[in-house]
């Protein structure tokens, strides 16, 4: 008889580069046998992972795998950071590898001083 654990398929050092202001879906691939497990997302903050309980999430079911999705509508600059998904089943908790979002703030990127400005006013680098 084959073992039937809930499984989370986020690879080591998974990362996404995204733009602030855009919508984004962060997927946690989940495999389960019978009953769909309770899955949550959390964001790493120091030594703890803070549950994201008030955020919009949804499930996407495919033939051999399901995805528990954390929605960013839109992405904000402070969404930058590392996230984990975790699943509860049979009183066990399993936590995925962390997945990191690198958020580029388009607004601040477009407002960066030019090379000429930085050459004449190097203190702008330290703002």
């Amino acid at each position: 008889k084959e073992s039937c654990d809930v499984q989370l398929y986020i690879k080591r050092q998974s990362e996404h580069s995204i733009l602030a202001g855009d919508p984004f879906e962060l997927e946690c691939p989940v495999k389960y046998c019978a009953n769909r497990p309770h899955v949550t997302w959390c964001k790493l903050n120091g030594t703890t992972c803070v549950k994201l309980e008030d955020r919009q999430t949804s499930w996407k079911e495919e033939k051999n795998i399901s995805f528990f999705i954390l929605h960013f509508e839109p992405v904000l600059p402070n969404d930058n950071g590392s996230y984990r998904c975790s699943a509860n089943f049979q009183s066990n908790l399993i936590e995925s590898h962390s997945t990191t979002l690198y958020v580029t703030d388009v607004k601040s990127a477009s407002e960066r001083p030019s090379k000429d400005e930085m050459a004449s006013r190097p203190w702008l680098l330290y703002r």
Epitope: V6, Q7, L8, Y9, I10, Q13, K31, S82, S96, H97
Partner: antibody, heavy 118, light 106 residues
């Protein structure tokens, strides 16, 4: 129950290749990744790489170009081939199953001794 | 790659006494650390994952702790069957193991 049973000991000449098999039972290779770890005599453990559920691979850069990991889901068997063997490759080679979250190795094969000697 | 430096290389402890093994990562690995026990002639066995979670069937005298770069495996009261080599392993990036600690009875 979960088991990983590896092929028998091998003796190879320098420059040759070796292919070690790992037959699993109690779980499916379409559901779990499998790692390969080696241990030289009296030494520590060295991760060689792994094969994911979809057949994609992730190799330790120290073995890149010399190691190939494959699997046959229908035979529930994973293979690790190491080429251009040298005496430093003499070691016990283990296959090990990834935990359901991929963050540790929970079941290990019994090991396969590979001796490289001229 | 991330280097895991384990100390001490060997340790002799009296039966019933506490044994402490340390592991230091060359960079932060969050809590992505596992500990394994290997007895002579056997394959490694998983003891601890997520740095502090005891694996199924592992006696509660084994405790893992730490976060970031510094990790510890503690055996609160050494038993004869605990004589083995212990390895830490990081799984934050491409997995690497510590060099091992040989635990013996004093």
């Amino acid at each position: 129950q979960v088991q990983l049973v590896q092929s028998g000991a091998e003796v190879k000449k320098p420059g040759a290749s070796v292919k070690v098999s790992c037959k699993v039972s109690g779980f499916s290779l379409t559901g779990y990744g499998v790692n390969w770890v080696r241990q030289a005599p009296g030494q520590g453990l060295e991760w060689m790489g792994m094969i994911w559920i979809d057949g994609s691979t992730d190799y330790n850069s120290a073995f890149q170009g010399r190691v190939t990991m494959t699997k046959d889901n229908s035979k529930s068997t994973v293979y690790m081939e190491l080429s251009s063997l040298r005496s430093e490759d003499t070691a016990v080679y283990y296959c090990a199953r990834d935990r359901p979250d991929g963050r540790a190795m929970d079941y290990w094969g019994q090991g396969t001794m590979v001796t490289v000697s001229s | 790659s991330i280097v895991m430096t384990q100390s001490p290389d060997s340790l002799a402890v009296s039966l019933g006494e506490r044994a402490t093994i340390n592991c230091k990562a060359s960079q932060s690995v969050s809590n992505d650390v596992a500990w394994y026990q290997q007895k002579p002639g056997q394959s490694p066995k998983l003891l601890i994952y997520y740095a502090s979670n005891r694996y199924t069937g592992v006696p509660d005298r084994f405790t893992g702790s730490g976060y970031g770069t510094d990790f510890t495996l503690t055996i609160s009261s050494l038993q004869a069957e605990d004589v083995a080599v212990y390895f830490c392993q990081q799984d934050y990036s491409s997995p690497t193991f510590g060099g091992g600690t040989k635990l013996e009875i004093k």
